[in-house]
């Protein structure tokens, strides 16, 4: 922490500008009025202060805000964004999309994934849900941040706004925020034709459930291998060979580059080698002919 | 414009391990597996695994027996190769190569990655 | 593991001339699953065919692949200064994926 010094007279300071950077850490502190620097952050950035300069400004206005910025503040960081942490940005409310475009900006090409899911989460917590304006904010400014959101913020997503999102921004998401997702989206689409369903419907289907992958197996809609990689294990075990070779068509043949990837492995460990041989890949590893398979947890079940 | 941009050019000691980096840009991550494949001075190619960077998942040439590891950073776009217990056949230039899922050719290539292994 | 065998290892060609290049399999290679790539000095590889006949883009039409079964051939139809590059192919059909030696073809 910065030592407390009383500040020399002829150092005192009226206002935010240039000749600040001549001054050293202790001098800053003693100073520089943090009323003073938060009505006139908007000077902040434009001065080339030292990283070391920048932590006494942050010391600054955390004493003067312990309970978080205010916005009018946080508007107006620049460069000292970078030297928040996220416990720092949790404390905020924010609610201004040029806000985190300001934001988001600086942050580009700094090491802040954190910082930045942290600050999406508080402009999502202050607007109240994730409206388009945000959703069209987030896809312009910080492709891919939409999967720093949890699944609860996700779920705060009208349908209507699923279709300004792209595929590039689902790249990052999970399974668990592709499950609040999915749902959403086939509600958004559900008015298309086939072709034009797939095409998207496709981000979204790491979180399709069996039955739904099933109905697209009958629409010949030719997923790649890309797509049926995505698919949650638990909604490709069940496929059975032909449901398969009719939901990937053409790209069928691609199951034996990827046979050792999961879930394409585990799949082809549920499936009777007869009906693998059908699809003339040479995939080997399934159930062995004359086999009988008895599910135990059906067994359980009924005990 | 689609680019692999691999790290910089390494000299290691036997026995110590190197981790090389490998950033995607300009296509999306996930619908492309990453490979990696080394060719010793003056020698041909040889496939070292790959990595299935949506789930994860990786395959590995069984002649790297548990000294390969692959990872991914869904975030930064990059993956990276780790191969440890390094020896001098080891030296070597490393690619990591561009395989779309569900084919098994490799249309974009990083400039690659030359590891020196001497004592 | 497949082993691919290249022949031959070297070949120095004159322009305008036709050359091939033989990649035979130890066993069955599924053709959908072969490649060809092209490498010049202190360059990446680059890939030319795949899936043993599909050009791939940007690749001059003078080159050519075929083949099935274990045995495949790259034709240079008529050679150029550019080609000089050691030419490789390369299996995916079983693990591990192997290539083969490598030709290297010089500009007389």
């Known amino acids: 922490d910065v030592e407390r010094t009383t500040c020399p007279p002829e150092k005192e300071v009226h206002e935010i500008d240039e000749s600040l950077i001549f001054y050293k850490k202790r001098e800053l502190e003693a100073c520089v009025d943090a009323a003073l620097l938060a009505a006139q952050m908007d000077r902040v950035d434009a001065i080339p202060f030292t990283y070391e300069q920048l932590d006494v400004l942050k010391h600054k206005l955390d004493e003067l805000y312990p309970q978080g910025y205010p916005e009018s503040v946080i508007r107006h960081l620049g460069h000292l964004f970078l030297k928040m942490s996220p416990e720092d940005i949790r404390k905020w409310n924010v609610t201004s999309l040029e806000t985190l475009k300001a934001l988001l900006k600086v942050s580009k090409g700094h090491e802040m994934s954190a910082q930045v899911a942290t600050l999406i989460d508080r402009v999502v917590v202050g607007r109240g849900q994730l409206d388009k304006d945000t959703v069209d904010t987030l896809t312009a400014f910080c492709p891919g941040c939409l999967c720093s959101l949890s699944p609860e913020r996700l779920s705060s997503v009208p349908p209507s706004v699923i279709g300004a999102v792209r595929p590039q921004d689902l790249d990052t998401c999970g399974p668990r925020q592709l499950d609040v997702l999915y749902p959403k989206a086939r509600l958004a689409f559900q008015n298309m034709s086939g072709s034009e369903y797939f095409v998207k419907i496709r981000p979204f289907l790491g979180g399709a459930p069996t039955e739904d992958v099933k109905a697209l197996s009958q629409q010949n809609v030719s997923m790649d291998l890309a797509t049926f990689m995505k698919l949650r294990r638990e909604a490709v075990l069940p496929l059975t060979v032909a449901e398969v070779q009719k939901l990937l068509g053409p790209h069928v043949e691609g199951l034996k580059v990827e046979e050792q990837h999961s879930p394409v492995r585990d799949w082809i460990l549920k499936q009777r080698q007869d009906d693998l041989d059908t699809l003339g890949l040479g995939l080997q590893g399934g159930i062995p002919n004359g086999y009988l398979i008895l599910d135990l947890s059906v067994r359980e079940a009924l005990s | 414009e689609v680019q692999l941009v691999q790290s910089g050019a390494e000299v290691k000691k036997p026995g110590a391990s190197v981790k090389v980096s490998c950033k995607a840009s300009?296509?999306?991550?996930?619908?492309?597996?990453m490979d990696w494949v080394r060719q010793a001075p003056g020698q041909g190619l040889e496939w070292m695994g790959d990595i299935n960077p949506s789930t994860g998942g990786t395959i590995y040439n069984q002649k790297f027996n548990g000294r390969v590891t692959m990872t991914e950073d869904k975030s930064a776009s990059t993956v990276y190769m780790e191969l440890s217990s390094l020896r001098s056949e080891d030296t070597a230039v490393y690619y990591c190569a561009r395989r779309r899922i569900g084919t098994g050719y490799f249309d974009v290539w990083g400039q690659g990655t030359t590891v020196t292994v001497s004592s | 593991e497949i082993v691919l065998t290249q022949s031959p290892d070297f070949q120095s060609v004159t322009p305008k001339e036709k050359v091939t290049i033989t990649c035979s399999a130890s066993?069955?290679?599924?053709?959908?699953?072969l490649s060809w790539y092209q490498q010049k000095p202190d360059q990446s590889p680059k890939l030319l065919i795949y899936r043993t006949s599909n050009l791939a883009s940007g690749v001059p039409s003078r080159f050519s692949g075929s083949g099935s079964g274990t045995d495949y051939t790259l034709t240079i139809n008529s050679l150029e200064a550019e080609d000089a590059a050691t030419y490789y192919c390369?299996?995916?059909?079983?693990?591990?994926?192997?290539f083969g030696g490598g030709t290297k073809v010089e500009i007389k």
């Open positions: 300009g296509y999306t991550f996930t619908d492309y597996n």
């Open positions: 066993s069955s290679v599924i053709s959908s699953y």
């Open positions: 390369h299996q995916w059909s079983s693990f591990p994926y192997t």
